[in-house]
C-alpha cells in the first residue's frame, strides 16, 4: 500500500484570499483505505472525503492557520502526515515618506507596509537600499506595528513601519533610494520595493539654502517593483518636513517641458507656458488644497493660476502638465518668499 499527500511539503504558506487543496490518498491491497483529516477547525464542506482519499480545501482565511493531520489506515496499518498551514497577507502596499529626499539635510525616511499578516518582526524585514546594496550609515529607528482599521470584523491585519535617519547622501547625490520589505515564510520569500527619489541640483552640489535660486529636479531610476514612475508627481508630498526653501522647480527631464513663472505684481499669479512648437497645450494639474478653489485661465500654450480672493499663494506644490507628451513641471512655493522663475 502507498500513502501520499499532495503537495507533499510539511509546511505550506497560503496567501490570504487564495485557495489551496491538499489531497491525501492511500491505496490498500485488502479493501478500501480509510483516509481522513483531523486537527483543523474546518467549517462544513472544507473537507471532501472519497474512498481512499480526502481533500482538504484551504480558503486562505486566518482560521485556516493550523496543523491538520491526515490519517490513513489500511487493515492494521496506519500512516499519518501533518501539514503546517500558514496563511499570510503581503500585498504590494508600501508607502514611503517623504515622497522625495533632499540632499544636505538631516532627515528621517519612513516605509510602511500595509495589510500585513503575520505581523512578526522575525518574518518581516525592512531594508533601505542604494542600488542593490543596503545604504551604509543609515540608522534604523524603532519599528512600529499598528492594527489596520478593518471595514468588517474578522482578519486582524497590521501595518508595520520602519524609519531610518539618513546619512549624508554625498555629492553627487544618488538618483533614488529604495525601501525593500521582505516577508520570509516557510519555503517562500516575498519582496516588495518602493522608490524614494532624490532631488538633484542642476548647477551646484551644495545643499539648498533659503536664498539660492537654482532649480531642483526630481530624478528617478525605474525598477520593476517600483510603483511610481518617479517623473510625474501626482500627489502632494506628505506634510512637513519638506524644506522651507525659495521656490524650487521639480520637473521631468526631457527635451522640452513647460516653464512656470510667478508674477508678484499680478497678486501672486502663476503662469505656465510651453514653447515646444505648435499644437502644445498646458494646464494646471496640482495645487495645494483643492485645485477647483483657484482661478484658472487656459489658452493653448499658456495657463494662468491665481488665488481667489487675491492674496498670497498657499504654501505647497503646484504642477503644470503639457500635452501631448505629458511632461510636467512642479513648483514648490514655501509662502512669503521672494519668487523665482522655474527653469
Amino acid at each position: 500500500q502507498s500513502f501520499q499527500v499532495n503537495p507533499p511539503e510539511s509546511e505550506v504558506a497560503v496567501a490570504m484570499g487564495t485557495s489551496l487543496q491538499i489531497t491525501c490518498s492511500m491505496s490498500c491491497d485488502e479493501g478500501v483505505a480509510r483516509v481522513h483529516w483531523r486537527g483543523l477547525d474546518t467549517s462544513l464542506g472544507s473537507v471532501q472525503t472519497l474512498p481512499g482519499s480526502s481533500i482538504l480545501s484551504v480558503r486562505g482565511m486566518l482560521s485556516d492557520t493550523g496543523t491538520p493531520v491526515c490519517v490513513g489506515s489500511c487493515g492494521s496499518r496506519s500512516f499519518q502526515h501533518s501539514v503546517k498551514i500558514l496563511v499570510y497577507a503581503f500585498p504590494d502596499q508600501l508607502v514611503v515618506s517623504p515622497e522625495f529626499l533632499v540632499p544636505g539635510q538631516d532627515q528621517v525616511v519612513s516605509c510602511t507596509a500595509h495589510n500585513i499578516w503575520p505581523a512578526d518582526p522575525n518574518s518581516l524585514s525592512f531594508a533601505l537600499l542604494l542600488g542593490e546594496q543596503r545604504l551604509e550609515g543609515a540608522q534604523a529607528l524603532e519599528p512600529e506595528q499598528e492594527e489596520e482599521i478593518q471595514e468588517a470584523e474578522g482578519t486582524p491585519l497590521f501595518r508595520m513601519t520602519q524609519r531610518w535617519r539618513l546619512p549624508s547622501l554625498g555629492t553627487p547625490a544618488p538618483p533614488a533610494l529604495h525601501c525593500q520589505v521582505t516577508m520570509q515564510l516557510p519555503k517562500l520569500v516575498l519582496t516588495h520595493r518602493k522608490e524614494i527619489p532624490v532631488l538633484q541640483s542642476q548647477t551646484s552640489p551644495k545643499p539648498p539654502n533659503t536664498t539660492s535660486a537654482e532649480p531642483y529636479i526630481l530624478t528617478s531610476s525605474s525598477t520593476a517593483e517600483a510603483v511610481s514612475t518617479g517623473l510625474n508627481i501626482t500627489t502632494l508630498p506628505s506634510a512637513p518636513p519638506y524644506p522651507k526653501l525659495s521656490p524650487r522647480t521639480l520637473s521631468s527631464e526631457g527635451p522640452c517641458r513647460p516653464k512656470i513663472h510667478q508674477d508678484l505684481e499680478a497678486g501672486w499669479e502663476l503662469l505656465c507656458e510651453a514653447s515646444c512648437g505648435p499644437g502644445v497645450t498646458v494646464r494646471w494639474t496640482l495645487a495645494p488644497g483643492d485645485l477647483a478653489t483657484y482661478h484658472k485661465r487656459e489658452a493653448g500654450a499658456q495657463a494662468w493660476l491665481s488665488v481667489l480672493p487675491p492674496g498670497p499663494m498657499v504654501e505647497g506644490w503646484f504642477q503644470c502638465r503639457q500635452d501631448p507628451g505629458g511632461e510636467v513641471t512642479n513648483l514648490y512655493v514655501p509662502g512669503q518668499v521672494t519668487p523665482n522663475s522655474s527653469s
Epitope: 538631516d106 543596503r134 550609515g137 529607528l141 524609519r163 546619512p167 549624508s168
Partner: antibody, heavy 119, light 107 residues
Framework: EVQLLESGGGLVQPGGSLRLSCAAS????????MHWVRQAPGKGLEWISY????????NYADSVKGRFTISRDNSKNTLYLQMNSLRAEDTAVYYC????????????WGKGTTVTVSS | DIQMTQSPSSLSASVGDRVTITCRAS??????LAWYQQKPGKAPKLLIY???SLQSGVPSRFSGSGSGTDFTLTISSLQPEDFATYYC?????????FGQGTKVEIK
C-alpha cells in the same frame, strides 16, 4: 565652546517625580538630536531616550517607557527629562548627550546629575 | 535589540604596553560603532566613531578597526592617563546599546 550641563537631580522617594534639565551652549541646539543616558552605581551605560531637533521624533528604552518623558525648548536651548513613578532601579547618574548629524554617535556629553530613589 | 559584548571585562597593563579590547555585536552593525573612555566620576568621552575614525583631539595612539560584528580598540602605547573604563556602543539601530565596559587597570 560646546557645553552641556545637567541639573535637577536629587533624592526622591519611590513613586515620586523629578524633572531633569540639560542646558546647551556653544552650538545651534535645534539642529541636533539629543539623548539621555544613565549609569547606575558601579554599572555600565544605558541609553534611555532621544528627541529629534524639532521634537517630531522621540523614543524610550523599554525600562522607562510610559514613565519618563523627554522634551526640549529650543528657544531656551534646554533639554528635559520628566521622570514619574520612580523606582529604586532608576537610581543613577543621568547624562545628556548630543547626537552627531549624519553619523549618529554621541559626540558631546554633559557632566551628569545624580538621581537617588530611596525611601 | 542588538547585544554588545566586550572582552575582557578588565585587564591589567603597564605604561607603554599595547592594549587591545574587543567588542562583538549580536548582529551586523556595518561600521556604526563608537568607543568611549570614562574615568571615575566623569562623563564618557568619545574616542572613535564609525569603527575607525579618530575623534578630533584624541591622541593617535588610540585606533579602532572592524566591521560587521567584530571590532577592536587598540591603545598602541598605554599612558598613565589612559587608565579608565572603555565602552563600545552600536548606533546602527535603536535602542542604541553599549558594551558592559572594559576596565584598564595599572599592573
Amino acid at each position: 565652546e560646546v557645553q552641556l550641563l545637567e541639573s535637577g537631580g536629587g533624592l526622591v522617594q519611590p513613586g515620586g517625580s523629578l524633572r531633569l534639565s540639560c542646558a546647551a551652549s556653544g552650538f545651534t541646539f535645534s539642529d541636533f538630536w539629543m539623548h539621555w543616558v544613565r549609569q547606575a552605581p558601579g554599572k555600565g551605560l544605558e541609553w534611555i531616550s532621544y528627541i529629534s531637533g524639532d521634537s517630531g521624533y522621540t523614543n524610550y528604552a523599554d525600562s522607562v517607557k510610559g514613565r519618563f518623558t523627554i522634551s526640549r525648548d529650543n528657544s531656551k536651548n534646554t533639554l528635559y527629562l520628566q521622570m514619574n513613578s520612580l523606582r529604586a532601579e532608576d537610581t543613577a547618574v543621568y547624562y545628556c548627550a548630543r547626537d552627531r548629524p549624519y553619523y549618529y554617535y554621541m559626540d558631546v556629553w554633559g557632566k551628569g546629575t545624580t538621581v537617588t530613589v530611596s525611601s | 535589540d542588538i547585544q554588545m559584548t566586550q572582552s575582557p571585562s578588565s585587564l591589567s597593563a603597564s605604561v607603554g604596553d599595547r592594549v587591545t579590547i574587543t567588542c562583538r555585536a549580536s548582529q551586523s552593525i556595518s561600521r556604526s560603532l563608537a568607543w568611549y573612555q570614562q574615568k571615575p566620576g566623569k562623563a564618557p568621552k568619545l574616542l572613535i566613531y564609525a569603527a575607525s575614525s579618530l575623534q578630533s583631539g584624541v591622541p593617535s595612539r588610540f585606533s579602532g578597526s572592524g566591521s560587521g560584528t567584530d571590532f577592536t580598540l587598540t591603545i598602541s602605547s598605554l599612558q598613565p592617563e589612559d587608565f579608565a573604563t572603555y565602552y563600545c556602543q552600536q548606533y546602527k539601530s535603536y535602542p542604541v546599546t553599549f558594551g558592559q565596559g572594559t576596565k584598564v587597570e595599572i599592573k
